[in-house]
Interface confidence: medium
Amino acid sequence: KFSKQSWGLENEALIVRCPRQGKSSYIVDWYYSQTNKSIPTQERNRVFASGQLLKFLPAEVADSGIYTCIVRSPTFNRTGYANVTIYKKQPDCNVPDYLMYSTVSGSEKNSKIYCPTIDLYNWTAPLEWFKNCQALQGSRYKAHKSFLVIDNVMTDDAGDYTCKFIHNENGANYSVTATRSFTVKDEQGFSLFPVIRAPAHNETKEVEIGENTNLTCSACFGKGAQFLATVQWQLNGNKITDFSEPRIQQEEGQNQSFSNGLACVNTVLRIADVKEEDLLLRYDCLALNLHGLRRHTIRLSRK
């Protein structure tokens, strides 16, 4: 839980955050775990600690190893570990799997590719973007803030996309690159006003007090990949996150495609250890996209 993998390329900047979070006012000490040697905080050093961040400016292959961060409050010390690996630059264009960040997928309607880890760095727009090592040129490609938008995505837009930016530290500039795969869903899609498949409006579900129960909100939005389509639950008109009841949890929406090509999303509301007071709540299944909002209400009753 409190160990995190980080990686980078030699001669580039790498910034790592301590996986053990604390209040921003807390002191954070960093150590190289193998030697228990303290990481200096003076910025003149190539590797230095800056609060919750560990900075390699630039990184070297020999920096690889496990780094310990100790977050110190006035009365408590809590420990986290950053497992850092610095790789040699590849002579050819090929980016090996171990340097790849998570894959993202897109379609004609939604083709944002975010530059990984960029929020840790002091960078200025615009980003440079490369696909399979070739600089992206042309009006189809728009570098916007920390992401790339591709207009009229086609299947051959799939590939490995690398963002390159400059990190500035006290007037000195350091290059950073990060690569992730982009896959394209090949479909001619369209979007509709949301259609809620379940629950039926004003449905009542019978539950056993003390048992667990799941409510599924399922809605369809059209065909193909959908832009800004969400399915969520509300309790008495409030977001689940605003309703401080740990027994009631909403799962992240799961995308579902049917044989007829409909793009649907299911969001499950899990209620653990059903209580009498849960029967008094109004459960709203909300489906929202650019066309509008549809709401179905369900209530619970005792079996």
């Epitope: 979070q21 408590f76 740990p246």
Partner: antibody, heavy 123, light 107 residues
Framework: EVQLLESGGGLVQPGGSLRLSCAAS????????MFWVRQAPGKGLEWVSA????????YYADSVKGRFTISRDNSKNTLYLQMNSLRAEDTAVYYC????????????????WGQGTLVTVSS | EIVLTQSPATLSLSPGERATLSCRAS??????LAWYQQKPGQAPRLLIY???NRATGIPARFSGSGSGTDFTLTISSLEPEDFAVYYC?????????FGQGTKVEIK
């Protein structure tokens, strides 16, 4: 020196109400999440309620939800627990305690506790 | 909610002996586990946090170990003032929960 001092306990009939207070000193009260924990006579510890430093987020155990309300007045360095519809099973020593770390609703340990105030619910 | 089960319920030992107290969680709590000591008529006192770290001012004879679901509090050599009830507490998720306690009594 950190100090927490509970008050407001006493004998109350079932269905009655009581308001507990906890006066804090020796630390920046508004920077800390605060808790109420209770202990029935001869029994173990049971978490009752928690409130974030700024007072916006509150949390309750199932056994008291809808009956108890936690609040705080940061200008007075005081934590409160309003207890309504009291039952015999609410009889316990009520402790207020400080969470020295919690960030955004993730709890930690309780490093300072008051000496407790006894609430007895009986007819 | 996460249930913490402490064993044994009572431990009868003499001063100078080693005490080993166990706390088992119904699901993994990583290292988000604390130990408290409580003497009669007093409030609980924090001993250990993050499974193995001693709180400020706690003597070195107290040590904690374990992660996931199985945890141990060890008192290497019991002092007269160590005879008390010990509770474990998890804080990985709401609601925080306590074990039912282990009483360490003089044999």
């Amino acid at each position: 020196e950190v100090q927490l001092l509970e008050s407001g306990g006493g004998l109350v009939q079932p269905g009655g109400s009581l308001r507990l207070s906890c006066a804090a000193s020796g630390f920046t009260f508004s920077s800390y999440d605060m808790f109420w924990v209770r202990q029935a006579p001869g029994k173990g510890l049971e978490w009752v309620s928690a409130i974030a430093g700024e007072g916006g987020r509150t949390y309750y155990a199932d056994s008291v939800k809808g009956r108890f309300t936690i609040s705080r007045d940061n200008s007075k360095n005081t934590l409160y627990l309003q207890m309504n519809s009291l039952r015999a099973e609410d009889t316990a020593v009520y402790y207020c305690a400080r969470d020295p770390w919690s960030t955004e609703g993730s709890f930690f340990v309780l490093d300072y506790w008051g000496q407790g105030t006894l609430v007895t619910v009986s007819s | 909610e996460i249930v913490l089960t402490q064993s044994p319920a009572t431990l009868s030992l003499s001063p100078g002996e080693r005490a080993t107290l166990s706390c088992r969680a119904s699901q993994s709590v990583d290292d988000d586990l604390a130990w408290y000591q409580q003497k009669p008529g007093q409030a609980p006192r924090l001993l250990i946090y993050d499974a193995s770290n001693r709180a400020t001012g706690i003597p070195a004879r107290f040590s904690g170990s374990g992660s996931g679901t199985d945890f141990t509090l060890t008192i290497s050599s019991l002092e007269p003032e160590d005879f008390a009830v010990y509770y474990c507490q998890q804080y990985i998720g709401a609601p925080i929960t306590f074990g039912q306690g282990t009483k360490v009594e003089i044999k």
